[in-house]
């Protein structure tokens, strides 16, 4: 029994004066607590607690369930205990079958013994199955068997407490271990879409998916730079004992322009936190913005190909697109497609493929696009570069030599005189008159130039060359002169193409 200094309160004394007492089932338990300030006896086993205000605790016919710790307490709060085993060969274990563990923590299999003298007190797997190799335990006859550092893999493990009695193995009722997992990583969060574009009045709904090992993960939607509590709806699934999924859906039933901003889905557990954001842009009405991918003024050589390409942003989705030339709509030769397959895509591409363009096919090509809110258009001015063509080359009645050439860009006409039989006409002749004539063709067509020289300047036989040229090429026409006496004649004019 404990001894204390005189004058200090001392704990009660118990008879019999030992820490453990073994009695047989059916025998009497008689415990006496001696203390002038006696308050109560308390009996504890598993989750059961009983009290007795008598200083003598008497159980006439002891049962296995009377096994447990008997504590006597005095008015100073000091106490003394004795542990009583009620040996019952038919009931070797007292059990509380609830068995819960936290991953990486110890947990107690509550199967205290009624007989401390049995041997090989341990755990066994159900139906003869072996326990996990790494499972470590410490037996304590008064409390049960402590499993050390519970693993996630032990979840749903079926086991028995076991002892050897008279050479035979005796098993308790079965226990099923339920393990609550520890968080060993941050939650995995994802969002249904990274950005949303809406018109005023439309519903905004975005879903955040949170995945973790258990439902105790915390999650919330937050508006960046705002403390306003957002209305969320949750759904969840237990895809497995350690595979939990929550969907947190944020809804604004009628979005306004000032709802635009960044929304964050935030999740945390005891390991750490994770977040993902989505951007909402609310516009008062739809829009279309067109961006030409090439210059809107296009120069192309005769017979070559050109692609007119636009990118455009359209919200809501484009409904009608067309390419127009000279009030005619193209039914083919063009394609229109989204810039990306992303669900949030608002950017599109339209391409008109013009092949082997003729000089007569210059002009304004217009792309038109519309959606339910707006229309938009862009025009391309296409100029077809053509080498000059000499339309007329004549000697006029007034003695003038006239050369008319057409082409694009505007041709330049130069005159040369070749005396005698020389092949090369190098001596240039200044024109008397040069005019750019209005073309009768469509706009963006060939430009017509007329140039004249005075033939009276020529005193010898020879050839006059009219050379029309531009960036694309050149063409020449020739006038042959022969003098008969004092008369000058124009002999058959002819043209010669010089590439």
């Amino acid at each position: 029994q404990p001894s204390v200094s005189p004058g200090e309160p001392s704990p009660p004394s118990i008879h019999p004066g030992k820490s453990d007492l073994i009695v047989r089932v059916g025998d009497e338990i008689r415990l006496l607590c001696t203390d002038p300030g006696f308050v109560k006896w308390t009996f504890e086993i598993l989750d059961e607690t009983n009290e007795n205000k008598q200083n003598e605790w008497i159980t006439e016919k002891a049962e296995a369930t009377n096994t447990g710790k008997y504590t006597c307490t005095n008015k100073h709060g000091l106490s003394n205990s004795i542990y009583v085993f009620v040996r019952d060969p038919a009931k070797l274990f007292l059990v509380d079958r609830s068995l819960y563990g936290k991953e990486d923590n110890d947990t107690l299999v509550r199967c205290p013994l009624t007989d401390p003298e049995v041997t090989n007190y341990s755990l066994k797997g159900c139906q003869g199955k072996p326990l996990p190799k790494d499972l470590r335990f410490i037996p304590d006859p008064k409390a049960g068997i402590m499993i050390k550092s519970v693993k996630r893999a032990y979840h749903r493990l079926c086991l028995h407490c076991s002892v050897d009695q008279e050479g035979k193995s005796v098993l308790s009722e079965k226990f099923i271990l339920k393990v609550r997992p520890a968080f060993k990583a941050v939650p995995v969060v994802s969002v249904s879409k990274a950005s949303y574009l809406l018109r005023e009045g439309e519903e905004f709904t975005v879903t955040c998916t949170i995945k973790d090992v258990s439902s105790s993960v915390y999650s919330t939607w937050k508006r960046e730079n705002s403390q306003t509590k957002l209305q969320e709806k949750y759904n969840s699934w237990h895809h497995g004992d350690f595979n939990y999924e929550r969907q947190a859906t944020l809804t604004i039933s009628s979005a306004r322009v000032n709802d635009s901003g960044v929304f964050m889905c935030y999740a945390n557990n005891t390991f750490g936190s994770a977040n993902v954001t989505t951007t909402l842009e609310v516009v008062d009405k739809g829009f279309i913005n067109i961006f030409p991918m090439i210059n809107t003024t296009v120069f192309v050589n005769d017979g070559e190909n050109v692609d007119l390409i636009v990118e455009y942003e359209a919200f809501p989705k484009p409904e009608h697109q067309q390419w127009i030339y000279m009030n005619r709509t193209f039914t083919d030769k063009w394609e229109d497609y989204p810039k990306s397959e992303n669900e949030s895509n608002i950017r599109y591409v339209s391409e008109l493929h013009l092949t082997r363009l003729k000089g007569t096919e210059g002009g304004t090509y217009t792309f038109l696009v519309s959606n339910s809110d707006v229309n938009a258009a862009i025009a391309f001015n296409v100029y077809v570069n053509t080498k000059p063509e000499i339309l007329t080359y004549d000697r006029l009645v007034n003695g003038m030599l006239q050369c008319v050439a057409a082409g694009f860009p505007e041709p330049t006409i130069d005159w040369y005189f070749c005396p005698g039989t020389e092949q090369r006409c190098s001596a240039s002749v200044l024109p008397v008159d040069v005019q750019t004539l209005n073309s009768s063709g469509p706009p963006f067509g060939k430009l017509v130039v007329q140039s004249s020289i005075d033939s009276s300047a020529f005193k010898h036989n020879g050839t006059v060359e009219c050379k029309a040229y531009n960036d694309v090429g050149k063409t020449s026409a020739y006038f042959n002169f022969a003098f008969k006496g004092n008369n000058k004649e124009q002999i058959h004019p002819h043209t010669l193409f010089t590439p």
């Epitope: 819960y100 979840h155 749903r156 339920k178 393990v179 609550r180 258990s214 439902s215 105790s216 993960v217 915390y218 999650s219 919330t220 949750y234 759904n235 969840s236 699934w237 237990h238 895809h239 497995g240 004992d241 929550r246 999740a267 557990n269």
Partner: antibody
Amino acid sequence: EVQLLESGGGLVQPGGSLRLSCAASGFTFSDYGMSWVRQAPGKGLEWVSAIGYGGGGKYYADSVKGRFTISRDNSKNTLYLQMNSLRAEDTAVYYCAKDTWWLAGLFDYWGQGTLVTVSS
Amino acid sequence: EIVLTQSPGTLSLSPGKRATLSCRASQSVSNSYLAWYQQKPGQPPKLLIYWASTRESGVPDRFSGSGSGTDFTLTISSLQAEDVAVYYCQQYYSTPLTFGGGTKVEIK
């Protein structure tokens, strides 16, 4: 010993409000998810709302969404259900139920219930 | 939402007889996340079976559960007078959590 004690029920007119409480004892309240389940007179069980033990998830049946709010005060070991815009069909015994240790939505302990009557 | 349909609505049997209660789900209940509860008159429900077939601590072994996917069964191997109650199945795989309509077990 686990105990759950509901209170706050009573007679209320349609459109009115009530706040139910559930006082918990005998276990570490903050370690467990909790739910409210109701039972209309002579009818079956209907899950109403749940709250995670970290407070990290609040769930509602469609029939009460937007009208009822679940909350908890771990310092007081108490679960609450704020019920607004009450309707006749909300008349029921309301039970608070404790999740099992290892999994939410599975209930190993229930209170005795509190009766809510919505009538004019 | 997973809808649970219980049958029969009422089961009347003599003591000692075998009672078989059925619970059918509108879609698969993954991982056998299905429970059975017993509710006696004037009392709250009591958990009997979870994981479709695991008996809760303290539940007599005459109660057993079986099944997976969409079809589940609660069996009382030898009906006792104290088993008179309404029995509910419940899925806890996904929210909203749902209960079956219940089967009333009576003694004939």
